[in-house]
C-alpha cells in the first residue's frame, strides 16, 4: 500500500482466483483513543472499533472511502483504491491502446518546436467517475523539472456504437535548452482513477522524436508567364523555433485533385517557394519537417489552384543562406569553411538516417541505455552551440563538435561496427565513417590540435549485443549530427562574410 495523495491510498493486488489479497491497517487521524467506529462509503454498518482498523483487501468491494467517527462526528477519511496486477502485468483497462506507433501505446505526445513545451493525449471510452493527474521530469535518476497543467477533455468522437473521449495535457520543461542535444529523455507519468480502480501509464521520449511542426502558413500562388507553371510560396509556421537559419525546415509540395487516386505533381525543397504545375480543380499542398532530424511531417496546408492570385506574401526566412567559405575570424581561433561544413553535415544527417532509418522508432531504451550512450559526447547547453553562443565565440562549439566527430568516427571504426555481423566498407555506415572523418578534418586542419575525448571500452562479445549497440550508437549519432548541421547552417547564413 502507498499514498497517492493526502488520505488516498493505493493497494496493489495480485489479481487471480482465490488470491489472498493484502492486509491493510488503517489508522484514524485523531488524538482520540476511545469510542471510535469505522464505516465504508455510504453504509452505516460498523466495520470495527478502535483507533486502527485491519482489513483484508481482495476485491473492489473492499475498496472505497473508510471513515472513522466518534459520537456521530467524522474524524477522518481514508480512500482505498485498487491497482490490479494480472500475470505480473499491471492492468490497463482505463485507457485505450492507440497502437501507434506500436502496440501498447496509451499516451501520445507531440511538440510543435524545441522550446520544451509539449502536449500529450490519451483516449478512453469511460465518461464518468474519472480523474487524471500528470507528472513529468527530464530523466528519472536525477530528475529535472517539467511542469504539467491539468488534464482536460479535449475531444469527443463517436466510434461505431461507442463514444471515445480524448484527454490532453500541456507540459513545459522548466529550464529548456532548445539548441542542445538531449541526452536524458522526458518521462511522463499519468495517474488514472476510475471509480475505485487506479492505473498508471508512462511514456519516455526525447523532444526531438516527438517534433511535429505546424503547417506552413501564408501560402501564395503566382502564375508564371507563358507557362503552365505556378510559383507557390509560403512561410515558416509562427510556432516553429527561431532563428530559422538554425532551426531549419524542409518542405514537400504537392498538387493533387480531390481524390487521392488522381494524378499529382510533387517536389521537395528546403526553400520557401517552389514551381509546380497547377491543374483546374486541384489544390496545392505544402507540409514541413525538421530538415536535419526525421521526426513527423506537419499536416498539409492547402490552397486551391483556381485561387492563383498575383499577390505575394513574404517568402519566410527559412532558407539558410549560402555564403562563401572564407569566414571572419572569431575570438580564440580561425573559423571553418562554414558552407563546406554545412554541406557535409547535411550529408551526414542523410547518411545517419539511411544507415539505420528505423533507429528513431525502435524503443531500445529498456535495454539499459544509460551505460552505453551516457559515454558518448553530447552537445550540451553550456557548449555555446546555440545561435547566441555561436555569435559570441563559435570556437567553443566547434571544438565540442570536433570532439564528437572524432569520437563517433572511432566508434564506427571499432569492433562494434567491424565485427560480426559484418558491414561492407561502402555501406551507408562505411560512407558515414568516411564523412565523419572528412568533416572533422575540415574543422581541424593539420597542425591545429584540440583535445579529444577518450573512447569508452564497449566491446560486446555477442553479435546480437553488437547489433543492439550499433542501433544505439547510430541513434545518438543522428541527434548529434542534427545539432552539428544546425550549427553549420546557421554559421553559413550568418557568420560568413
Amino acid at each position: 500500500i502507498w499514498e497517492l495523495k493526502k488520505d488516498v491510498y493505493v493497494v496493489e493486488l495480485d489479481w487471480y482466483p482465490d488470491a489472498p489479497g493484502e492486509m491493510v491497517v488503517l489508522t484514524c487521524d485523531t488524538p482520540e483513543e476511545d469510542g471510535i467506529t469505522w464505516t465504508l462509503d455510504q453504509s452505516s454498518e460498523v466495520l470495527g472499533s478502535g483507533k486502527t482498523l485491519t482489513i483484508q483487501v481482495k476485491e473492489f468491494g473492499d475498496a472505497g472511502q473508510y471513515t472513522c467517527h466518534k459520537g456521530g462526528e467524522v474524524l477522518s477519511h481514508s480512500l482505498l483504491l485498487l491497482h490490479k496486477k494480472e500475470d505480473g502485468i499491471w492492468s490497463t483497462d482505463i485507457l485505450k491502446d492507440q497502437k501507434e506507433p506500436k502496440n501498447k501505446t496509451f499516451l501520445r505526445c507531440e511538440a510543435k518546436n524545441y522550446s520544451g513545451r509539449f502536449t500529450c493525449w490519451w483516449l478512453t471510452t469511460i465518461s464518468t467517475d474519472l480523474t487524471f493527474s500528470v507528472k513529468s521530469s527530464r530523466g528519472s535518476s536525477d530528475p529535472q523539472g517539467v511542469t504539467c497543467g491539468a488534464a482536460t477533455l479535449s475531444a469527443e468522437r463517436v466510434r461505431g456504437d461507442n463514444k471515445e473521449y480524448e484527454y490532453s495535457v500541456e507540459c513545459q520543461e522548466d529550464s529548456a535548452c532548445p539548441a542542445a542535444e538531449e541526452s536524458l529523455p522526458i518521462e511522463v507519468m499519468v495517474d488514472a482513477v476510475h471509480k475505485l480502480k487506479y492505473e498508471n501509464y508512462t511514456s519516455s521520449f526525447f523532444i526531438r522524436d516527438i517534433i511535429k511542426p505546424d503547417p506552413p502558413k501564408n501560402l501564395q500562388l503566382k502564375p508564371l508567364k507563358n507557362s503552365r507553371q505556378v510559383e507557390v510560396s509560403w512561410e515558416y509556421p509562427d510556432t516553429w523555433s527561431t532563428p530559422h537559419s538554425y532551426f531549419s525546415l524542409t518542405f514537400c509540395v504537392q498538387v493533387q485533385g480531390k481524390s487521392k487516386r488522381e494524378k499529382k505533381d510533387r517536389v521537395a525543397t528546403d526553400k520557401t517557394s517552389a514551381t509546380v504545375i497547377c491543374r483546374k480543380n486541384a489544390s496545392i499542398s505544402v507540409r514541413a519537417q525538421d530538415r536535419y532530424y526525421s521526426s513527423s511531417w506537419s499536416e498539409w496546408a492547402s490552397v486551391p489552384c483556381s485561387g492563383s492570385g498575383s499577390s505575394r506574401g513574404g517568402s519566410g526566412s527559412g532558407g539558410s543562406g549560402g555564403g562563401g567559405s572564407k569566414l571572419r575570424a572569431v575570438p580564440g581561433g580561425s573559423s571553418p569553411a562554414w558552407t563546406q561544413c554545412q554541406q557535409l553535415s547535411q550529408k551526414l544527417c542523410t547518411l545517419a538516417w539511411s544507415a539505420h532509418p528505423l533507429v528513431g522508432h525502435m524503443d531500445l531504451r529498456e535495454e539499459g541505455d544509460e551505460e552505453t550512450t551516457n559515454d558518448v559526447p553530447h552537445i550540451q547547453c553550456g557548449d555555446g552551440c546555440d545561435p547566441q553562443g555561436l555569435r559570441d565565440n563559435s570556437q567553443f562549439c566547434l571544438q565540442r563538435i570536433h570532439q564528437g566527430l572524432i569520437f563517433y568516427e572511432k566508434l564506427l571504426g571499432s569492433d562494434i561496427f567491424t565485427g560480426e555481423p559484418s558491414l561492407l566498407p561502402d555501406s551507408p555506415v562505411g560512407q558515414l565513417h568516411a564523412s565523419l572523418l572528412g568533416l572533422s578534418q575540415l574543422l581541424q586542419p593539420e597542425g591545429h590540435h584540440w583535445e579529444t575525448q577518450q573512447i569508452p571500452s564497449l566491446s560486446p562479445s555477442q553479435p546480437w549485443q553488437r547489433l543492439l549497440l550499433r542501433f544505439k550508437i547510430l541513434r545518438s549519432l543522428q541527434a548529434f549530427v542534427a545539432v552539428a548541421a544546425r550549427v553549420f547552417a546557421h554559421g553559413a547564413a550568418t557568420l560568413s562574410p
Partner: antibody
C-alpha cells in the same frame, strides 16, 4: 496492368516530320500524365515534354519548343508526338511513358526507332 | 537547366559484390532524384524514386540515399541480371534532366 504500345520504326529525310503514336491500356487514359523521352544510339536519355490527356496541357523542354507537338485522342486512348524539321541528330529511339506522378517515369512503352537519313 | 553528372562511367564488379553508383547535381535538388535501370534493347525501368523510396517489385538489394547535390545508388550484392546501365534523373525543376549513365559490367 498498365501497358503502352508504340507505333513501328520510321525512316525520314532531313527536314521532314514524324508522328509517333502510343496506345495506352489497363488504366483510365486521363488519369496519368504522358511523357516523351528519347535516346540517341549509344547515348543517354533526354526528356522532351509531357501532356495531360485530361485537358491537353503540355510542357516542352526548351530544346524542342516550336518543333514538337504532343497531342492525345481520349476516344482511342492514344498519345501522339510529332517532331518537325528533322535533322540527322534526331535519330533516336523515342519512348512514351505514363505515370500518375508528373516528374518521374514509371511505365514505359517499348520505344520507336526513328532514323533521319538523306 | 540542372546538369546531372554520373560517376564512374563504367563500373566493373564481380557477381555477389556490392556496387555503389554516384550522381551529382549542378545545384541543390533536395531529394528530387530518381534512379532507372536499362538493359540492352529494353526500355528503362524505375528502381528508386525521391532519392531513397523503394518501388514494389524491385529487389531489396537496390537502395538509394543522398540529398542536396550528392546521391548514391547501392546494389548490395550484384546478381547476373543487374548488369545494365543505370541513370539518375532530377525532378527539381523543368526541364527534367538525366545523368549520362553508369554502365555496370561483369569484372
Amino acid at each position: 496492368q498498365v501497358q503502352l504500345v508504340q507505333s513501328g520504326a520510321e525512316v525520314k529525310k532531313p527536314g521532314a516530320s514524324v508522328k509517333v503514336s502510343c496506345k495506352a491500356s489497363g488504366y483510365t487514359f486521363t488519369d496519368y500524365y504522358l511523357h516523351w523521352v528519347r535516346q540517341a544510339p549509344g547515348q543517354g536519355l533526354e526528356w522532351m515534354g509531357w501532356i495531360d490527356p485530361e485537358n491537353g496541357d503540355t510542357e516542352y523542354a526548351p530544346k524542342f519548343q516550336g518543333r514538337v507537338t504532343m497531342t492525345t485522342d481520349t476516344s482511342t486512348s492514344t498519345a501522339y508526338m510529332e517532331l518537325r524539321s528533322l535533322r540527322s541528330d534526331d535519330t533516336a529511339v523515342y519512348y512514351c511513358n505514363a505515370n500518375k506522378e508528373l516528374r518521374y517515369f514509371d511505365v514505359w512503352g517499348q520505344g520507336t526507332m526513328v532514323t533521319v537519313s538523306s | 537547366e540542372i546538369v546531372m553528372t554520373q560517376s564512374p562511367a563504367t563500373l566493373s564488379v564481380s557477381p555477389g559484390e556490392r556496387a555503389t553508383l554516384s550522381c551529382r547535381a549542378s545545384q541543390s535538388i533536395s531529394i528530387n532524384l530518381h534512379w532507372y535501370q536499362q538493359k540492352p534493347g529494353q526500355a528503362p525501368r524505375l528502381l528508386i524514386y525521391f532519392a531513397s523510396q523503394s518501388i514494389s517489385g524491385i529487389p531489396a538489394r537496390f537502395s538509394g540515399s543522398g540529398s542536396g547535390t550528392e546521391f548514391t545508388l547501392t546494389i548490395s550484392s550484384l546478381q547476373s541480371e543487374d548488369f545494365a546501365v543505370y541513370y539518375c534523373q532530377q525532378s527539381n525543376s523543368f526541364p527534367l534532366t538525366f545523368g549520362g549513365g553508369t554502365k555496370v559490367e561483369i569484372k
